[in-house]
């Protein structure tokens, strides 16, 4: 058993059929010695008397808010949550496996630049009685500070029969050095509590691996005289790291016909302009990627050819 926060405790339960459970001793936080009784949640049934209460925690029915009283007065509370292990594996019931980029991916994180700011998000089908707490650091043995905000509900979607909820959190490395080579990964830890169930999820990454630039901005077309060609120009996104001479991007320019079946013409360039043939009813799209490290491409920025 360990303390999650004041008066909230997590019991680690290795569960299997007929498991004996965990013996837990609760102590009433009071100088009183006599006349103390214990109850669970809203029930008035007395579970025991004395300054300590010993319980056998076998299942969620044994978890909840234990209260010690004296003469009708509440002395203290202890909320017991369960962290369940089955077949040697901690439960991961609260969050949905996003399966990207691999199975058992519960947390996904992205950074728009090298400033040390990043966003993580996760999915759940649970709509109520749900709280998240996020902590982060660089490295784990001698951790350097990363400050995370509160997790917030960022999207709701309908997926077949179920509603899906996306939560996200923003974090900032306290002493980020954008130009430095990373040697220790960022660690992100999410505590999830649903009703009386506790679970924790972790992710470990280098900022360079989670970079995804914003799409190029100010995408414009300039027709070339007496030609089907156009000059496409764009700019680095505002959110990208500066100076651009050091934090450089490479770009992919795509001409896509109205039909998805039509052949796509693609051009790769390190410049912020390119000359392409603009077909009728086609659109031109540009996306960006770090020039020197193959992290994710940005989403496309698009303009119609007409």
């Amino acid at each position: 058993i360990w303390e999650l926060k004041k008066d909230v405790y997590v019991v680690e339960l290795d569960w299997y059929p007929d498991a004996p459970g965990e013996m837990v001793v609760l102590t009433c936080d009071t100088p009183e010695e006599d006349g103390i009784t214990w109850t669970l949640d809203q029930s008035s049934e007395v579970l025991g008397s004395g300054k300590t209460l010993t319980i056998q925690v076998k299942e969620f029915g044994d978890a909840g808010q234990y209260t010690c009283h004296k003469g009708g007065e509440v002395l203290s509370h202890s909320l017991l949550l369960l962290h369940k292990k089955e077949d040697g594996i901690w439960s991961t019931d609260i969050l949905k496996d996003q399966k990207e980029p691999k199975n058992k991916t519960f947390l996904r994180c992205e950074a728009k630049n090298y400033s040390g700011r990043f966003t993580c998000w996760w999915l759940t089908t649970i709509s109520t009685d749900l709280t998240f707490s996020v902590k982060s650091s660089r490295g784990s043995s001698d951790p350097q500070g990363v400050t995370c905000g509160a997790a917030t509900l960022s999207a709701e979607r309908v997926r077949g029969d179920n509603k899906e909820y996306e939560y996200s959190v923003e974090c900032q490395e306290d002493s980020a050095c954008p130009a430095a080579e990373e040697s220790l990964p960022i660690e992100v830890m999410v505590d999830a509590v649903h009703k009386l169930k506790y679970e924790n999820y972790t992710s470990s990454f280098f900022i360079r691996d989670i970079i995804k630039p914003d799409p190029p901005k100010n995408l414009q077309l300039k027709p070339l005289k007496n030609s089907r060609q156009v000059e496409v120009s764009w700019e680095y996104p505002d959110t990208w790291s500066t100076p651009h001479s050091y934090f450089s991007l490479t770009f992919c320019v795509q001409v896509q016909g109205k039909s998805k079946r039509e052949k796509k013409d693609r051009v790769f360039t390190d410049k912020t302009s390119a000359t392409v043939i603009c077909r009728k009813n086609a659109s031109i799209s540009v996306r960006a990627q770090d020039r020197y490290y193959s992290s994710s491409w940005s989403e496309w920025a698009s303009v119609p050819c007409s």
Epitope: P17, F60, T125, G160, D161, L196, K197
Partner: nanobody, 123 residues
């Protein structure tokens, strides 16, 4: 919202068997832990059995252990309770319930409930 409908109840002789079914609609049961409870006249609702969302874990009340088997078919969105060696004291209305906490024998840990199906065991 999950709607649960129990079926399969009836009148049987002591020692006989019965299979209850609980069909869900409105939402997939894939993310729900499922349980069976029962209530005899003049008594509180009593836990019978529960099964984890993937069907890999089961948990029974001592009074039914070895006689009752809970199972589920997520493709059919249905949970079953196979009851054998029935006794007169098994007579009750049997309720199907869905929740998020496995294992739990406490009724308030379940979020959705069916209307119940009557099982009567005569001696």
């Amino acid at each position: 919202e999950v709607q649960l409908v129990e079926s399969g109840g009836g009148v049987v002789q002591a020692g006989e068997s019965l299979r209850l079914s609980c069909a869900a609609s409105g939402r997939s049961l894939n993310n729900e832990e499922m349980g069976w409870f029962r209530q005899a006249p003049g008594t509180e609702r009593e836990f019978v059995a529960t099964i984890s969302r993937r069907g890999t874990g089961t948990y029974y009340a001592d009074s039914v252990k070895g006689r009752f088997t809970i199972s589920r078919d997520n493709a059919k969105n249905t949970v079953y309770l196979q009851m054998s060696s029935l006794k007169p004291e098994d007579t009750a209305v049997y309720y199907c319930a869905a929740g998020q906490l496995f294992p739990s024998s406490r009724s308030r840990d379940y979020d959705y409930w069916g209307q119940g199906t009557q099982v009567t065991v005569s001696s």
